[in-house]
């Protein structure tokens, strides 16, 4: 209630002679701060004096007096919250009740804490789970109701007196709720741990033994079994007898049932520890074990492999792989049930014995078509020889052989003809299903293996075919040898290398890219006129009049081909210059006179120069010279000069006459 001081601390603390005790404690006073604190040992209230009597272990007052015992006993608290205490070392006679006498300005309180100090270190306590099963992880807990900052301890686990390999996790608690040291060990017990002793040992900081606790492990496990067989090697022949015995080496709890298994399947009516097999057959070969069950579950013995020996059975052949591709590798496997395994094999190909083949497997690294056929074998062991089985069929597949492309046409073939070709082959497995042709074209295939080329091109040089089953086999290309008229006929200037100037020596070549047959004739023409019949057309000294459009023709026995028209351009300096006058060569003063310099030039004249009768140049550079207004003094002979990139040309003199106007004559 509200009239009480509120304290929190463990109810009882445990320790032993020479150790220490640490008392975690919190409080809340009724009013104000703590002014006085006394720690009593076994306090008793004196009604006469209204005070407590008892041994004072610690005293803290306003005047600051402290008894000598205070070195051993320490108050680690404060004036309002903390009342933690430490006694180090603690003695046997400290057992009993500790009384915390607290006084504030107006209130008093006595709080009691039990202290249990034993003569020797008390043992920890091992806690086990209710049931332990083999191979199931469990946690072993070792708990000690002690912890003190001034007295370090450790807890160690032992199994049959030997420290355990597993890592333990130690934790301590020093709180107002609890004080303890705990060690937890995670452990997966095996059936062999059943009945073994586990110890938790309390040690001081130096590893010195202080106390311990022990428990015996009760590990529940399935029965552990041993199997014995007669004969000991478990190898017998058909008709022999076999005895197997099952022995239980350990079971917790006790076993309840026994059974026998062959190849994992339970044998009916076999529920005793002995299994008797009389006059065994080869079918009784297999893996035997006994199974014994308890409440935990069934336990199985190791397996005994019983081998019943017999002569080989009729054999079968397995082929890897059929059909086989020519050139690939193939493996034949002779399969025959026998015990012991066959030691010798005889192989047959199409009923005929294959010499030198005595192994279970026959490997052919490179299959050829003649390897096809039926393969069979016979197996043999110490007990006898088996029978030859039905055998297996090897199918050898290969691309079409000896493929040829055949031209059906009469030769020679001319450009534009229709050409028929056929694709032939010698043998094929599997059968030919399609044909391919090279090069590809928009050609007809009127029937399988026949190609029709309509309007054959001059450049259809060679054709090859392929016959295809799962693979394609290509024939060597066959030359069509198509004959055609000359192609790509063109005129080419051989000389000069640069532009043609008047007076140059000029050679034109009639070129063509190809012709079949190669024997050709040439023709040159200009404006429909025949000029020559050589491959070259030569001009010793070209003149402007030779300029024009030239063509050449090339023909062979198939036909003739013309070049594109080729323009021959001749460059020359301005020529045939003359000065023309407008409106005429006689003009009245004051009017306008236009002089024009006319010329023939290639390339055209770039600029003109004008001269008067004294050969003085006039400041005009265009084709026309305009005099306006013209004066009588302008009468005289004029001439012009034209310039282009080739050179210059000049005109003869042309005379302009300027006469007086009627006005001028009238003034005179």
């Amino acid at each position: 209630d509200s009239s009480k001081w509120v304290f929190e601390h463990p109810e009882t603390l445990y320790a032993w002679e020479g150790a220490c005790v640490w008392i975690p404690c919190t409080y809340r006073a009724l009013d104000g701060d703590l002014e006085s604190f006394i720690l009593f040992h076994n306090p008793e209230y004196n009604k006469n004096t209204s005070k407590f009597d008892g041994t004072r272990l610690y005293e803290s007052t306003k005047d600051g007096k402290v008894p000598s015992e205070q070195k051993r006993v320490q108050f680690l608290g404060d004036k309002n919250k903390n009342c933690t205490l430490s006694i180090h070392p603690v003695h046997l006679n400290d057992s009993g009740q500790l009384g915390l006498r607290m006084e504030s300005k107006t209130e008093k309180w006595m709080e009691r804490i039990h202290l249990n100090v034993s003569e020797r270190p008390f043992p920890p306590h091992i806690q086990l789970p209710p049931e332990i099963q083999e191979s199931q992880e469990v946690t072993l807990t070792c708990l000690l109701n002690f912890s003190c900052y001034g007295y370090p301890i450790q807890l160690q686990w032992l199994l049959e007196g030997v420290p355990m390999r597993q890592a333990a996790v130690t934790s301590t608690s020093l709180t107002i709720k609890s004080v303890f040291t705990r060690s937890e060990l995670k452990f997966s017990p095996q059936w062999s741990h059943h009945g073994k002793i586990v110890t938790c040992q309390l040690q001081d900081a130096d590893g010195k033994f202080l106390s311990n606790d022990t428990v015996q492990l009760n590990v529940k496990h399935t029965p552990k079994l041993e199997i014995k067989v007669t004969p000991s090697d478990a190898i017998v022949r058909e008709g022999d007898s076999v005895t197997m015995t099952c022995e239980v080496s350990s079971s917790n709890p006790e076993y309840t049932t026994v059974s026998w298994l062959k190849d994992g399947t339970s044998l009916k009516k076999q529920n005793t520890f002995t299994l008797n097999l009389r006059e065994v057959t080869k079918d009784q070969s297999g893996k035997y074990c006994c199974q014994v069950s308890n409440d935990v579950g069934p336990g199985r013995s190791e397996e005994v492999f019983l081998q019943v020996q017999y002569a080989p059975e009729p054999s079968t052949v397995q082929i890897l792989h059929s059909p086989a591709v020519e050139g690939s590798q193939v493996e034949f496997l002779c399969m025959s049930l026998a015990n012991p395994l066959p030691t010798n094999y005889t192989w047959y190909h199409n009923g005929k014995e294959m010499q030198g083949r005595t192994e279970e497997k026959v490997h052919i690294p490179k299959i050829l078509p003649w390897h096809a056929g039926t393969y069979s074998c016979v197996a043999e062991n110490i007990l006898g020889t088996g029978q030859r089985g039905p055998g297996a069929e090897l199918d050898v597949q290969y691309p079409p052989k000896k493929v040829t492309t055949v031209i059906q046409n009469p030769m020679p073939i001319r450009e534009g003809d229709t050409v028929t070709l056929s694709c032939n082959y010698n043998s094929s497995n599997p059968s030919v299903t399609r044909y391919e042709w090279k090069p590809h074209g928009a050609w007809e295939e009127p029937s399988l293996g026949v190609l029709k080329i309509q309007n054959v091109g001059w450049d259809n040089t060679t054709i090859a075919c392929a016959a295809c089953n799962s693979w394609c086999s290509w024939a060597s290309p066959v030359a069509l040898n198509v004959q055609y008229a000359p192609r790509d006929v063109r005129v080419r200037k051989i000389k000069p290398l640069s532009e043609i100037h008047s007076g140059n020596s000029v050679s034109l070549q009639c070129d063509f890219s190809s012709s079949h047959p190669k024997e050709v004739q040439f023709f040159w023409e200009k404006n429909g006129r025949l000029l020559g019949k050589e491959s070259q057309l030569n001009f010793d000294s070209i003149s402007p009049e030779d300029a024009g459009s030239y063509s050449c023709w090339v023909n062979n026995s198939i036909g003739q081909t013309a070049s594109k028209a080729w323009t021959l351009e001749v460059l020359y300096a301005p020529r045939r210059l003359r000065v023309s006058m407008s409106p005429g060569d006689q003009v009245m003063e004051g009017k306008s006179a236009t002089l024009t310099c006319e010329s023939d030039a290639n390339p055209p004249v770039s600029h003109y120069t004008w001269f008067d009768w004294n050969n003085q140049s006039l400041p005009y550079h265009s084709q026309k010279l305009r005099l306006e207004p013209v004066k009588v003094q302008h009468s005289g002979a004029y001439w012009c000069q034209g310039t282009n990139s080739v050179g210059k040309g000049r005109s003869p003199l042309s005379t302009l006459t300027v006469y007086y106007s009627p006005e001028t004559i009238g003034r005179r």
Partner: antibody, heavy 123, light 107 residues
Framework: QVQLQQSGPGLVKPSQTLSLTCAIS??????????WNWIRQSPSRGLEWLGR?????????DYAVSVKGRITFNPDTSKNQFSLQLNSVTPEDTAVYYC??????????????WGQGTTVTVS | DIQLTQSPPSLSASVGDRVTITCRAS??????LNWYQQKPGKAPKLLIY???SLQSGVPSRFSGSGFGTDFTLTISSLQPEDFATYYC?????????FGQGTKVDIK
């Protein structure tokens, strides 16, 4: 070196005649290696060639179409100068007027020597 | 009449820049094309005559090229005194004509 010195009024009334003179020093107006040109410049028309006078075996004049019929060039050999007369002027004739030599030799009639320019306002 | 078209009408450049001005004639004028520089309040000054010949006294950073109808004036490394207006002019036929000008100013 060759120099051209311009003279003439800066202000002319509309419909009157504009007269400008260009005095030559270091060359002859009647030399046969030059042309003597008049050029004007205004913001609206830029540089505009008005015409030229030159002597070879006779005196020649060339006029721009824009001023033909209103313009006259007069060479004066005694004073070694040449003049421009532009009749019936309008405000459109307001411009800076330049005289320039056209070098008819290697310079291909380029204007290598210019007068200082005369600003003429028609108002 | 022969028309001359200059481009660009104006351009901004920095000292040290390479500057190119083009002039196109409406018909072939051979090599009768001249280039002038004009500064405010001054008469034009001849730089290049006959398309590519440098006028006496003009710095070698100025050069001209072209023939027929297309011509170019190049200033290889622009100097502070080169900020001005540049004109082309043909002396091939009368009337002699000028381009409209290209103004070069400081960027």
């Amino acid at each position: 070196q060759v120099q051209l010195q311009q003279s003439g009024p800066g202000l002319v009334k509309p419909s009157q005649t504009l007269s400008l003179t260009c005095a030559i020093s270091g060359d002859s107006v009647s030399g046969n290696r030059a042309t003597w040109n008049w050029i004007r410049q205004s913001p609206s028309r830029g540089l505009e060639w008005l015409g030229r006078t030159y002597y070879r075996s006779a005196w020649y004049n060339d006029y721009a179409v824009s001023v033909k019929g209103r313009i006259t060039f007069n060479p004066d050999t005694s004073k070694n100068q040449f003049s421009l007369q532009l009749n019936s002027v309008t405000p459109e004739d307001t411009a800076v007027y330049y005289c320039a030599r056209g070098e008819s030799g290697a310079a291909a009639d380029a204007f290598d020597i210019w007068g200082q320019g005369t600003t003429v306002t028609v108002s | 009449d022969i028309q001359l078209t200059q481009s660009p009408p104006s351009l901004s450049a920095s000292v040290g820049d390479r500057v190119t001005i083009t002039c196109r004639a409406s018909q072939s004028i051979s090599s009768y094309l001249n280039w002038y520089q004009q500064k405010p309040g001054k008469a034009p000054k001849l730089l290049i005559y006959a398309a590519s010949s440098l006028q006496s006294g003009v710095p070698s950073r100025f050069s001209g090229s072209g023939f027929g109808t297309d011509f170019t004036l190049t200033i290889s490394s622009l100097q502070p005194e080169d900020f001005a207006t540049y004109y082309c002019q043909q002396s091939y036929s009368t009337p002699q004509t000028f381009g409209q000008g290209t103004k070069v100013d400081i960027k």
